[in-house]
Interface confidence: medium
């Protein structure tokens, strides 16, 4: 093999190259030196590098590596960030539409209930939004609160409209009676089942996307070890010390170095693959009662059916409640107010099913397909980075970390590096703590995704019957019990054309009792959860 050419006597070439990295500083020797103080670019003869230059090269090499890693993950990162934002906003839009449909149902069918109903509906859907975003709210409590609040109004306005003002002190009793007498039949339980299943899946879907971003962000901002910095310096910069400015590293050598540097990151691969496949499984199961769009946009109809159920049994109920709540204590009636702005367009709500709309469901599947093209992202990283940094083609006339070689031999390179640095040791060190943490988070989300009670294939949720739903409450297929009937009812069959909606300002609905603007209740931690961070002052 040809001996490496000596650097020029004045180290001019090396100096001019180094000046680009570190302008102004005179760290380059004036003439080639023995370089006995060097620790990375161990010379075989005189060198134009100093210890200070070596340190600068190491720093630059690590920065280069970080930039390469960031550019490698840019497309994937953008894909997940964009979709997480799109879905979060789309879910907000679904919630807003569902709220408006429900308000419209009350306005069209039960105008006497509207002031209070709007308020209760608004609170319910605000909680739905917060739940999706991760708030610690119990779905059953949300549904119970909705029906608990609605019943006193239904009783006093629809069933007993002649009730004198003095009788309005029975609210608490009516709230209690609502559950005890099952005045809405099994509709509340049905809604609980549908809403909790669909929201749970929606919430974990968003959680998983956000974790995906966290995974990429973590690996994106990894700080590479000093050992890795030395290997990179040897590969990219030590050739400069010998005046070899135009020579490129050998491709095979680059792969060895990258696998060493990325050993920890590559450990994510197994869990990343599982993450994408588990997410795919989740998405495949997001239909019917596991699809919040389907469930929430049909809620108005189920609520309407539930009120009709009450009206059907009004005679019997009025008698029972008359006895039960005769001696309630005085209690002021809850104040109610009209929202300023309902944004209800009856024409829009009457729209029939529109074919070929882009639905949330198709968007989810599209995302999964794109994500699957990144399933080998972590295992392929070393190769990707080498292919996107300068390496010699065909491993001919290239730099192997010590010298210029005609052909790269991994064995020779390893032998030559033994006394400098052990690649095997680097691999054995295990992943960085941040990588271990992100692996733990991936394991956790994968477990959550796997354990979600999702429908396997097209199985009807007949177990709802076992939970005590009366067949008369809905149609034959309980989990499709969403699009109720009733004269003058609005049929909502079409899925949201949510992408068109995204341009629509989410905060337009900001009227009292109708507000979907997230207030800081989505700060989903409480003081008493925080106490884990410090000694617990709880009594």
């Amino acid at each position: 093999q040809p001996p490496p050419p000596p650097p020029d006597a004045t180290c001019h070439q090396v100096r001019s190259f180094f000046q680009r990295l570190q302008p102004g500083l005179k760290w380059v020797p004036e003439t080639p030196v023995p370089g006995s103080d060097l620790q990375v670019c161990l010379p075989k003869g005189p060198t134009c590098c100093s210890r200070k230059m070596e340190e600068k090269y190491q720093l630059t090499a690590r920065l280069n590596m970080e930039q390469l890693l960031q550019s490698a993950s840019m497309e994937l990162k953008f894909l997940i960030i964009q979709n997480a934002a799109v879905f979060q906003e789309a879910f907000e839009i679904v919630v807003r539409h569902a709220k408006n449909y429900t308000n419209a149902m009350f306005k069209n069918n039960y105008p006497s209930l509207t002031p209070q109903a709007f308020e209760f509906v608004g609170e319910f859907f605000t909680d739905v939004s917060l739940y999706i975003l991760g708030s610690d709210i119990n779905v059953d409590d949300m549904v119970n609160e909705l029906f608990d609040s609605l019943f006193p109004v239904i009783y006093t306005q629809l069933m007993n409209p002649g009730l004198p003002d003095s009788a309005l002190d029975i609210n608490e009793c009516l709230r209690g009676a609502r559950r005890d007498l099952k005045v809405f039949g099994n509709f509340p339980k049905l809604i609980m089942t549908q809403v909790s299943k669909s929201l749970q899946v929606t919430r974990i879907f968003l959680q998983a996307l956000n974790l995906g971003i966290e995974v990429i962000n973590t690996t994106d901002h990894l700080k590479f070890s000093k050992d890795c910095g030395r290997m990179l310096t040897r590969m990219w910069y030590c050739s400069y010390c010998q005046g070899l400015m135009m020579v490129k590293p050998c491709g095979g050598y680059c792969n060895v170095v990258m696998q060493g540097c990325m050993a920890g990151v590559v450990e994510i691969d197994k869990y990343w693959r599982e993450y994408i496949l588990s997410l795919e499984e989740l998405v495949n199961g997001m239909y019917r009662i596991y699809d919040m769009e389907n469930v929430l946009l049909g809620l108005f109809s189920t609520i309407h059916d539930s009120i009709q159920y009450v009206q059907k049994n009004a005679g019997k109920l009025t008698t029972t409640i008359g006895k039960l709540c005769a001696h309630s204590q005085q209690r002021q009636y809850r104040s109610a107010y009209y929202p300023e702005d309902l944004f209800i367009d009856k024409k829009v709500l009457k729209v029939a099913h529109v074919e070929h709309e882009e639905t949330l469901s198709s968007r989810r599947r599209e995302l999964i397909q794109k994500l699957k093209s990144f399933i080998s992202f972590y295992s392929a990283l070393p190769g990707y980075i080498c292919s996107h940094s300068p390496v010699a083609e065909n491993d001919t006339l290239c730099w192997n970390g010590q010298e210029l070689v005609e052909r790269y031999s991994q064995k020779a390179a390893r032998n030559g590096m033994k006394n400098q640095f052990n690649l095997h040791e680097l691999k054995m060190k295990g992943p960085e703590p941040v990588v271990s943490q992100i692996i733990d988070k991936l394991k956790h989300i994968n477990q959550l995704l796997r354990t979600m009670s999702m429908p396997k294939g097209r199985v009807l949720d007949k177990n709802l019957d076992e939970e005590g739903f009366e067949s008369g409450d809905c149609g034959d297929d309980e989990d499709e019990c969403i699009g109720g009937s009733g004269d003058g009812m609005i049929k909502v069959k079409n899925q949201l054309r949510f992408l068109a909606e995204l341009a629509y300002d989410l905060d337009v609905d900001d009227a009292p009792g109708n507000s979907q603007q997230a207030t800081p209740k989505d700060n989903e931690i409480s003081t008493f959860h925080n106490l884990g961070n410090v000694h617990s002052p709880l009594k």
């Epitope: 800081p520 700060n523 989903e524 931690i525 003081t527 410090v534 002052p537």
Partner: antibody, heavy 115, light 112 residues
Framework: QVQLQQSGTELVRPGASVKLSCKAL????????MHWVKQTPVHGLEWIGA????????AYNQRFKGKATLTADKSSSTAYMEYSSLTSEDSAVYYC????????WGQGTLVTVSA | DVVMTQTPLSLPVSLGDQASISCRSS???????????LQWYLQKPGQSPKLLIY???NRFSGVPDRFSGRGSGTDFTLKISRVEAEDLGVYFC?????????FGGGTKLEIK
Amino acid sequence: QVQLQQSGTELVRPGASVKLSCKALGYTFTDYEMHWVKQTPVHGLEWIGAIHPGSGDTAYNQRFKGKATLTADKSSSTAYMEYSSLTSEDSAVYYCTRFYSYAYWGQGTLVTVSA
Amino acid sequence: DVVMTQTPLSLPVSLGDQASISCRSSQSLVHSNGNTYLQWYLQKPGQSPKLLIYKVSNRFSGVPDRFSGRGSGTDFTLKISRVEAEDLGVYFCSQSIYVPYTFGGGTKLEIK
């Protein structure tokens, strides 16, 4: 809408105790923590502690432990802070504020400790 | 306790100017759930503090869009793009992640 109504100004003697009240309106009292904050020109805003009216759980700043006692009455949707062994250092405006993020505050109660 | 350091103490501005207030915490305010619990408030003389921004950058309802918050970990900034007369008062930052919760010392925004 959400409102927190605090009791009026208090002028008290050193060594005495005072019980401040904070009535919650416009939301479900038991769903949110109520926090108390002290404000003086010297120390600025200081977090005293919090109570969860639903569970009765309390958390205190060590600096105010033994000085402040937080309670809540669910039936009247009112939170209370009893402040004992008063000294001139305790002259301040005391606020109740609803977690999360302290989006809603009472109007404040001025306590003046003077012989 | 987590110390919240606000700078400057006083900020004289002309109406229509941009104002920027800094808040630094002695520990990272990132919770294990990924959220950063840093709030900004405005207190006008004789009034209670009013929430402007929560979780670093989220504007509370009714807060004009000239108010914006940014930052991460331990360094945070509140910006007012065009100061109006109604914006004058004392601005506080606070953290609600470590008990005891703590507030910054305040920055007084006043007319030059």
